[in-house]
Structure formats: structure tokens, C-alpha cells
């Protein structure tokens, strides 16, 4: 094998999904022609054929159709291989075998890599933390390759090595998801950083969490509200649920209850010193006085308006206190769409018509969909506008421009995304010529 074949000594590093060039070259003698060349790329470990060139012709890829030579450069001795859309499974050694009169070969290593995502940090428990509590901090980073190195440190940069458990799991593509768990006893406050290092790319992804244990005053009364937003129809009454656990011997004289808007602290309703102080919110709120002593601090909001939408804080103070916020999501159903046609008479196949679908007084903003008689979505040439009235309710007008066939049905669907309510209208245009609406 007197032919000298040259490849890079260092591995070729390629990111997953990108293209990689495995360089290979030889020195052609004077008078060399491609008809003399036999070039074979194969996997070193298994001799599986990857790509070949013989008898003056590129024999093509034998490797998932993801390889290519550089045909214009072969005559100059460039036998490099292009590997497209690199996968983790491609990692390994590739042998470049060149035969002219004599022959030679050399192997080049492909090192595959994928950067790790910025770690996400979670805390358990994640509220009412006090100095001395033990917390579990989880650091998760995704879709990297090869396996990561994980380091933890405190706010001063001091490494934290005790009580760390790290697991790495490969997905179907061979990419790793890393989960590292640190158990730590809280001090007065502290910052905990997690660094996920890709050893091939020398890429560091890091995140940190600063834990400030609760201060005095502590707010030890547990106030419970629904996690999900309360959905209320415009004009109806809504109950914003809020409850606390009264201690034995509790009397309403001890209770301070304040409902306020979370974002502005505007007072909504209050109960102090055993007395309902009434509504401070357009006289549309009420408590449930008979239920207060059992810990039911819920608020009734009457004749809901769009402007009521938002977050309400329920603040309860007895000996100690606590608060929680509940979200009100306002909704109004859309009317059945009315359909109009322009022009609306003497229509013939090939005419362009404008179909307008109008639906009124809904909230929040609607999603509008058009489709033909076969249920095929119509997305081109659609213009939708939504305008809020004084009450904040939306009127929707959606315009479809369409070229008429021999006949056809056009449907418009107006969806309220909160109520998951669909209002639809359709128009069928048949025959020729015709008038719309059809004459009686």
C-alpha cells in the first residue's frame, strides 16, 4: 500500500443535525485519470460500505442517502466525504480507502455533539420556606450529547458535592436528558447554581436559584383559593372562592378579611371587627356572612363585566394572617354568525365573490375558521377584524374572497377560546346564474 492517504489526526466534531466533512486526500500522479480511481469509504469497525467511486463513476451513498463526495475535486486528490444531517449513531471511525495503481487507506474519527439546554430549576417544597428547612433543588437540562458533567456551587462559588444525585437518560435519538438533584439545608438565604458542561463542546449551560426563606411577618394562616381561573359569563354572578381554617374558639370579632385587586391593591370588599364593611367595588360584591365563621371567605361578584377580569387577592388576618390570589376570567358567547355575499345576484362560475361572516358581542377575542363543503380549511384570502364595544365585548367580521365553482358551500366557524363554544354559519351557492339570498 504505497499510496499515501491523509486524514486529520483529531476527531471531526459535528453538531447533531448539521453536515460534517470527513477530509481525506491523496496525491495523484501525472496523467492520473478518474477512470483509474477506486475510492471506498467504510465504517472502520464493521466494514459497512458508506460510499464508493469506481470506474470513473460515483456509485452513490450506501449510508441512508446522507453522504456525498466532492466530484469536482476528486481529480485533484480530494476524496473527502460529506455526511449530511449528522446523528448520534454516526459517531465513530470512518476509513477512506484509495486505490489507483497502488492503494492506501486511513481512518478519520467523527465525534458527534449536541449542546445542552439552559437548565431549568425546580424547588421542593417551594413555598413557606424557613431557615433550617431541607429543600430538594432539581436541575434539568435536555437534548445534549455526549453525557454531561454536572457541577453545583453556592453563591460564593464554593462547590457543593455532598447530597447530589445525577441521572442521565438517552432518548430515541441518543440525546441525553440530565437531571441532577441537590438536597440542602436552608440558611438565612442562599443562591444555588447548577452548571451542565458538554465535555466535547466545552459548552457550559448554567442556571441558579436564589432562595429567600420567608421573613417576619410570616403569614402563617393558610388561605386557599382555586388554582384555575374562575370563568364567568358577562352579566352573570361569579363566586371567587377563598377559605381558611379557623382555630377552635375563633370568633368573627377577631377576623379581618380584605378582598382587593391584586395588581392595584384597590379595595373590593372588607369585613373587620365582626362587621361586614360592605362593597367598595361598584356595590356589586357580597360575602357569605353565614359561612364566615366556618372559614368561608368567598366573594360573590354580581353582574360580571369584562372590566372585572383579572386577579383578586383574599387577605385574611386573625391572630396571624395569610393571603392568596384568585383569577377571574370573563367570557361571553358569540352570536350565530350572519353571512352576506357581495355581489349577491347574477352569479356565475368563475366570478369572484366576497363572503362576510359576522358574529357579535363575544369575549375574549374569537378564533375564526373557514372551510368548504368538504370540510377542507380555506386560509387564503381571509381577512378578520375584531372590534371591542364600550362594554369590552368583541364584534367579529371575517371576509373570505373566493372564486365560484359550479356550486359550493362555505362555512364560517367563530370559536370562543375560553368557553370552547363554536358558533357557525354557512352559505351554499348553487346553479347559474343565481341570486343571493334565493328569491322566495
Amino acid at each position: 500500500g504505497a499510496l499515501e492517504v491523509q486524514v486529520p489526526e483529531d476527531p471531526v466534531v459535528a453538531l447533531v443535525g448539521t453536515d460534517a466533512t470527513l477530509c481525506c486526500s491523496f496525491s495523484p500522479e501525472p496523467g492520473f485519470s478518474l477512470a483509474q480511481l477506486n475510492l471506498i469509504w467504510q465504517l472502520t469497525d464493521t466494514k459497512q460500505l458508506v460510499h464508493s467511486f469506481a470506474e470513473g463513476q460515483d456509485q452513490g451513498s450506501a449510508y441512508a442517502n446522507r453522504t456525498a463526495l466532492f466530484p469536482d475535486l476528486l481529480a485533484q486528490g480530494n476524496a473527502s466525504l460529506r455526511l449530511q444531517r449528522v446523528r448520534v449513531a454516526d459517531e465513530g471511525s470512518f476509513t477512506c480507502f484509495v486505490s489507483i495503481r497502488d492503494f492506501g487507506s486511513a481512518a478519520v474519527s467523527l465525534q458527534v455533539a449536541a449542546p445542552y439546554s439552559k437548565p431549568s430549576m425546580t424547588l421542593e417544597p417551594n413555598k413557606d420556606l424557613r431557615p433550617g428547612d431541607t429543600v430538594t433543588i432539581t436541575c434539568s437540562s435536555y437534548q445534549g450529547y455526549p453525557e454531561a458533567e454536572v457541577f453545583w456551587q453556592d453563591g460564593q462559588g464554593v462547590p457543593l458535592t455532598g447530597n447530589v444525585t445525577t441521572s442521565q437518560m438517552a432518548n430515541e435519538q441518543g440525546l441525553f436528558d440530565v437531571h441532577s438533584i441537590l438536597r440542602v439545608v436552608l440558611g438565612a438565604n442562599g443562591t444555588y447554581s447548577c452548571l451542565v458542561r458538554n465535555p466535547v463542546l466545552q459548552q457550559d449551560a448554567h442556571s441558579s436559584v436564589t432562595i429567600t426563606p420567608q421573613r417576619s411577618p410570616t403569614g402563617a394562616v393558610e388561605v386557599q383559593v382555586p388554582e384555575d381561573p374562575v370563568v364567568a359569563l358577562v352579566g352573570t354572578d361569579a363566586t371567587l372562592r377563598c377559605s381558611f381554617s379557623p382555630e377552635p374558639g375563633f370568633s368573627l370579632a377577631q377576623l379581618n378579611l380584605i378582598w382587593q385587586l391584586t395588581d392595584t391593591k384597590q379595595l373590593v370588599h372588607s369585613f373587620t371587627e365582626g362587621r361586614d364593611q360592605g362593597s367598595a367595588y361598584a356595590n356589586r360584591t357580597a360575602l357569605f356572612p353565614d359561612l364566615l365563621a366556618q372559614g368561608n371567605a368567598s366573594l360573590r361578584l354580581q353582574r360580571v363585566r369584562v372590566a372585572d377580569e383579572g386577579s383578586f387577592t383574599c387577605f385574611v388576618s386573625i391572630r396571624d394572617f395569610g393571603s392568596a390570589a384568585v383569577s377571574l376570567q370573563v367570557a361571553a358567547p358569540y352570536s350565530k354568525p350572519s353571512m352576506t355575499l357581495e355581489p349577491n345576484k347574477d352569479l356565475r362560475p368563475g366570478d369572484t365573490v366576497t363572503i362576510t361572516c359576522s358574529s357579535y358581542r363575544g369575549y375574549p377575542e374569537a378564533e375564526v375558521f373557514w372551510q368548504d363543503g368538504q370540510g377542507v380549511p380555506l386560509t387564503g384570502n381571509v381577512t378578520t377584524s375584531q372590534m371591542a364595544n364600550e362594554q369590552g365585548l368583541f364584534d367579529v367580521h371575517s371576509v373570505l374572497r373566493v372564486v365560484l365553482g359550479a356550486n359550493g358551500t362555505y362555512s364560517c366557524l367563530v370559536r370562543n377560546p375560553v368557553l370552547q363554544q363554536d358558533a357557525h354559519g354557512s352559505v351554499t351557492i348553487t346553479g347559474q346564474p343565481m341570486t343571493f339570498p334565493p328569491e322566495a
Epitope: A188, T212, G219, T264, Q277
Partner: antibody, heavy 118, light 110 residues
Framework: EVQLLESGGDLVQPGGSLRLSCAAS????????MNWVRQAPGKGLEWVAG????????YYADSVKGRFTISRDNSKNTLYLQMNSLRAEDTAVYYC???????????WGQGTTVTVSS | QSVLTQPPSASGTPGQTITISCSGS????????VNWYQQLPGTAPKLLIY???QRPSGVPDRFSGSKSGTSASLAISGLQSEDEADYYC???????????FGGGTKLTVL
Amino acid sequence: EVQLLESGGDLVQPGGSLRLSCAASGFTFNTYWMNWVRQAPGKGLEWVAGINSKGGVTYYADSVKGRFTISRDNSKNTLYLQMNSLRAEDTAVYYCADWNDYDIMDVWGQGTTVTVSS
Amino acid sequence: QSVLTQPPSASGTPGQTITISCSGSSSNVGRRTVNWYQQLPGTAPKLLIYTNAQRPSGVPDRFSGSKSGTSASLAISGLQSEDEADYYCATWDDSLNAWVFGGGTKLTVL
């Protein structure tokens, strides 16, 4: 340790401007409403302005409305008070204080002195 | 002129009990909780009582607060020389959309 540290106080002429800063540490600044409170020499405490946790809602005392602007940069854990058209009666020690969910100002800075004089 | 009314001064001898009043209206004390602050000479105010009657950790139980209607009061029992300070009541006013303070009460321990 929970801390608020004011800076930016100075001697300024009537009609002049000044910007005060308050650096917060030791607590989750971006979840707290914040306030500026002042105290004129030998006088009582007077609330100046308040701002919500995201910075979108602000309240002002009538005496400073239209002249002072409260703002915050949560990425820097810093509260600001931009003071324009300053008057002699604005001379005071200015404190920043938190404003927690329970309508309590439980942490105060040490204050920075603003003197308005020609 | 402060929105909340406090006596400008109060005094007592060591061991005595004194009470400082704070009078407001239905838009502040009447529907909101009251906080009390102590300001020692040359220092920043410090939270003394919150939500009408609660003491932060570190505040001696000699200090107590209460509220009735549109008035609140701060009681200090077993008066000590280190209690000599200015005392302020404060709450949120829903009509003004503003924090309101009392004018402050200067406590002298004789």
C-alpha cells in the same frame, strides 16, 4: 440578610432634578411592591410614592404628583425615584421601604438626604 | 395636617403603661389594617406592630396594638428608658390611593 440601601441624595438648587436609587438584597425583590417615604427635618413620616412588583402600577402623594416618578429595574433589584422641579419643601431624608402582600412596610433602608436650597 | 391623628407627645415613668391613639376614617383605619412604627433618634423607622395587633419576632410583648372602628391604639406596658422614641401609625387609604401616616407621637420616659 434582607437589606435596602438608598443612594443619590445631594444638595440641589430649587427647580433642579435628582435621581435616587435603592438597591435591594436578601429577598425576592421582583415579587414585592415598593415605596418611597420621606421625613423633613424635625417632622413626621410622609409617604411619597409606591409601585407594584412588575412596575406597571404607580401611586403618588398629591404633593409630588407630576414632578416625581417612581420606577424599578427588577433585573438589577433596584428601585428609583426621579425628582424634577424640586422645591425647598422637598428637603428631607428619603427612605425606601418594601410593601408586602399583607400591606405592611416591614423593611426600611437607612435613608438618603436630599437638600433643596439656593 | 396628617390624615391620621395622633397626640404629638406622651410621657410616662419607668414601669408605667401608656397608650397612644390613632384616629382615622372609614376609608383608611375603618376598613384596612393598621401598622405601628418606632423611630429611635437618628435611625430609620422599624416595624413594631402589624395588622392591628401582631408583633414581629424580636419585639417585646410589652408592646400591643388594637383597633376599634376608625381608631387604633398602641399600648406600651412596663415602660423602659429605651422606649423613648417617635411612634407612628400607618395604613392604606382607599379614597386617596395612598399610604397615610399619623403625625407621630414623641414618647418621653421621665
